[in-house]
Interface confidence: medium
């Protein structure tokens, strides 16, 4: 009945106009559909131009839906990253503030004349946490060596201590343990704690980066055709009320998002590793206990040096010979009182427990993000049919959708009836992101075992290496030159999404 056919174009007019297109394109009545390139070629209310416009629109709508889903995930990861980063930085800053407040009173000039040494140490720890190319063990060894020289000179102002004598002192130091057990304990605990903290936070950054980059991967022309057919061909063919069959929608989106689904295995591995490393946040060698208590190890070390002063001096003289007396120098420094120690075990504030339990729950929730994406988009964005199977749009007409639902990932799309997928040509951006996930997972696994992995650049669009020492103004500037033997590659996106608000490394 021609009259009823022409009536059906009214609904198409309404939908087409609502999309912002010109209604002058829309035929008054159905026309023959030989000109259609995507939709089945029956009688239609769509011209070639309309079909092209709607194809472009459906493509854009799917990309928007995909970006929206990704944005929600990115926002969650970014919030987690900021929360953990703030907490870890706060622990270290708190420790430094405590040191600055208590050490002048506890140690007098033994501290104030070496305040820069302590400040530099905290700067290095901050940089190390942020993923800079520092070797923590070397940094700590250098700190103790320089501090020993300075303190030994201060404790013996009556002696002339030339460079060669100080060299000898340095060589004796390892055997003499002038600072007691503190340096060794701090080295072992700090390495484990800092590597756990920074790899966890970096894992959040890498995950967020992967989501951002994958969301920018364009959908191919075959996908565009299939999505047009899924979403708008029913309108063109005069069955505007027919909603897509659920399995039909899934096949279209599984084909469109085949490459994205291939992220699944490595994505799960990364998230599992991140959940696992949070075990390292607790206990006496845990992140909270160690990072927040650096100052107590330093206090212990200075106390040990003062307690061992006489024995140490005797042994140094035994090993290095009698130093000359400085005729200009004052008498030997009086023995100072011991600096009072804050309790080493910081009582847990509860903040970290709360952060970790929230993170674990949220990471578990998004574990199957990539493979559930087609189903999520179909159910949330595609207005699927809830009617019985034979009343939905199957791509050709209103009726049952017979093909089986494809598996996940590129290889499983070989026989996808809705999207022609070339399974021999994986998307290179997504392959790169799979590699990033693998690299980060390996780092997390090394970190779990307490190993300081060589944090090489895990990014393909690096944005400058992390730095910062809490300089109060910009009298600071980072020196990249490094005299030490380690030539570590800077990690160029140590904490993606965080601004370097702390000034540079030097001052």
């Amino acid at each position: 009945d021609p009259a009823s056919k022409s009536r059906s174009c009214g609904e198409v007019r309404q939908i087409y106009g609502a999309k912002g297109f010109s209604l002058s394109d829309v035929p008054q009545a159905e026309i023959s559909g030989e000109h259609l390139r995507i939709c089945p070629q029956g009688y239609t209310c769509c011209t070639s131009e309309m079909e092209e416009n709607l194809a472009n629109r459906s493509h854009a709508e799917l990309e928007t839906a995909l970006r929206d889903s990704s944005r929600v995930l990115q926002a969650m990861l970014a919030t987690q990253l900021r929360s953990f980063d703030d907490h870890f930085q706060h622990l270290l800053n708190d420790s430094e503030r405590t040191l600055q407040a208590t050490f002048p009173g506890a140690f007098g000039e033994l501290y104030t004349q070496n305040a820069r040494a302590f400040r530099d140490l905290y700067s290095e720890l901050r940089l190390y946490y942020r993923g800079a190319n520092l070797h923590l063990e070397e940094t700590l060894a250098e700190f103790w060596a320089r501090l020993l020289e300075r303190l030994f000179k201060q404790l013996h102002p009556q002696l002339l201590l030339p460079d060669d004598y100080l060299d000898c002192l340095g060589k004796q130091a390892e055997a003499l343990r002038p600072f007691g057990e503190a340096p060794r304990e701090l080295r072992l605990r700090a390495t484990r704690a800092f590597v756990a903290a920074r790899s966890f936070v970096q894992g959040l950054g890498v995950a967020s980066d992967v989501v951002r980059k994958v969301a920018q991967v364009p959908l191919g022309p075959e996908c565009s055709r299939a999505v047009m057919k899924l979403v708008y061909c029913a309108h063109c063919l005069g069955v505007p009320g027919a909603r897509p069959c659920p399995d039909y929608c899934r096949n279209v989106l599984k084909g469109c998002l085949a490459n994205q689904a291939d992220l699944d295995a490595e994505w799960r591995n990364l998230l599992d590793s991140m959940v696992l490393i949070t075990d390292k946040f607790w206990g006496t060698s845990g992140v909270e206990s160690v990072i927040g208590s650096v100052h107590t190890w330093l206090a212990e070390a200075i106390n040990a040096l003062q307690d061992n002063r006489d024995t140490l001096t005797a042994k140094v003289i035994q090993g290095c010979g009698n130093p000359k007396v400085n005729p200009q120098g004052p008498g030997p420094e009086e023995k100072r009182r011991r600096g009072k120690l804050a309790p080493r075990e910081r009582p847990p504030s509860g903040t970290l427990e709360k952060l970790v339990s929230e993170a674990k729950a949220q990471l578990r929730d998004v574990q199957d993000f990539w493979i559930s994406l087609p189903g999520t988009l179909c159910s949330e964005k595609m207005a699927l049919s809830t009617a019985s199977d034979d009343r939905c749009w199957n791509g050709m007409a209103r009726g049952r959708y017979l093909p089986e639902v494809m598996g996940d990932g590129l290889a499983n799309q070989i026989n996808n009836p809705e999207v022609e997928v070339d399974i021999t040509k994986p998307d290179m951006t997504i392959r790169q992101q799979i590699m990033q996930l693998k690299i980060m997972t390996n780092r997390l696994r090394s970190a779990y075992n307490g190993n300081d992995v060589d944090f090489q650049d895990a990014s393909d669009d690096g944005s400058g290496s992390g730095s910062g020492d809490g300089c109060l103004d910009d009298l600071c500037s980072r020196k990249v030159s490094r005299k030490s033997s380690s030539s570590r590659t800077p990690l160029t996106h140590a904490l993606p999404g965080l601004s370097e608000q702390e000034g540079q490394k030097t001052s």
């Epitope: 007098g108 020289e149 009298l475 500037s477 030097t506 001052s507």
Partner: antibody, heavy 123, light 106 residues
Framework: AVTLDESGGGLQTPGRALSLVCKAS????????MYWVRQAPGKGLEFVAG????????GYGSAVKGRATISRDSGQSTVRLQLNNLRAEDTGNYYC????????????????WGHGTEVIVSS | ASTQPSSVSANPGETVKITCSGG?????YGWYQQKSPGSAPVTLL????NRPSDIPSRFSGSKSGSTATLTITGVQAEDEAVYFC???????????FGAGTTLTVL
């Protein structure tokens, strides 16, 4: 004996860059922080820049902040000061100084000075 | 910046005290002598009271709170010079010098 020899001074054009070098000898160079201090005609001493023994930490006086870069080469026992966008007020004697400390940048720690190199910035 | 008196004067043999205040409490001071403009400064005392071996013992230093004092006991004609104190800005860790004190030996 500790000696510090500065070079690179002379007449400079405003807006251009200046590079001063200090050659150190008579001590274990890699142990100590090194500084550049200047003195404008008729004025007092002014801290320009300093660099810690490892080269990782540097500090700059407020007048040169953003224009100066200090670096060191332990192999050559030299310290270099690069000062960009020269101004008339950069005129003066530039002294290289050695710290008794490895840490940058305490002006209480200087135990040796070079003879200085004169810089005149004028068009 | 650290504050110094702009000038002091003394007769030979007298004791002269030059103060430097306004630095950060707990941090050290150095004292430097410059005999003529353009000549290299000479370190008299570094890190409060450490005297290089070639500096006469009449130069000594002390510190109370954030004020440092250079004492010249038995001043001599050759001590006529400008004396600068040096310290550190405790927030930026950049070096700072006092404006200098001119000592005139009458």
């Amino acid at each position: 004996a500790v000696t510090l020899d500065e070079s690179g001074g002379g007449l400079q054009t405003p807006g251009r860059a200046l590079s001063l070098v200090c050659k150190a000898s008579g001590f274990t160079f890699s142990r100590y922080a090194m500084y550049w201090v200047r003195q404008a005609p008729g004025k007092g001493l002014e801290f320009v820049a300093g660099i810690g023994n490892t080269g990782r930490y540097t500090g700059y006086g407020s007048a040169v902040k953003g224009r100066a870069t200090i670096s060191r080469d332990s192999g050559q026992s030299t310290v270099r000061l690069q000062l960009n966008n020269l101004r008339a007020e950069d005129t003066g004697n530039y002294y290289c100084a050695k710290s008794v400390s490895p840490y940058c940048c305490d002006a209480a720690d200087i135990d040796a000075w070079g003879h200085g190199t004169e810089v005149i910035v004028s068009s | 910046a650290s504050t110094q008196p702009s000038s002091v004067s003394a007769n030979p043999g007298e004791t002269v005290k030059i103060t430097c205040s306004g630095g950060s409490s707990g941090y050290a001071y150095g004292w430097y002598q410059q005999k003529s403009p353009g000549s290299a400064p000479v370190t008299l005392l570094y890190s409060n009271n450490n005297r290089p071996s070639d500096i006469p013992s009449r130069f000594s230093g002390s510190k109370s709170g954030s004020t440092a004092t250079l004492t010249i006991t038995g001043v001599q004609a050759e001590d006529e010079a400008v004396y600068f104190c040096g310290s550190v800005d405790s927030s930026s860790y950049a070096g700072i010098f006092g404006a200098g004190t001119t000592l005139t030996v009458l």
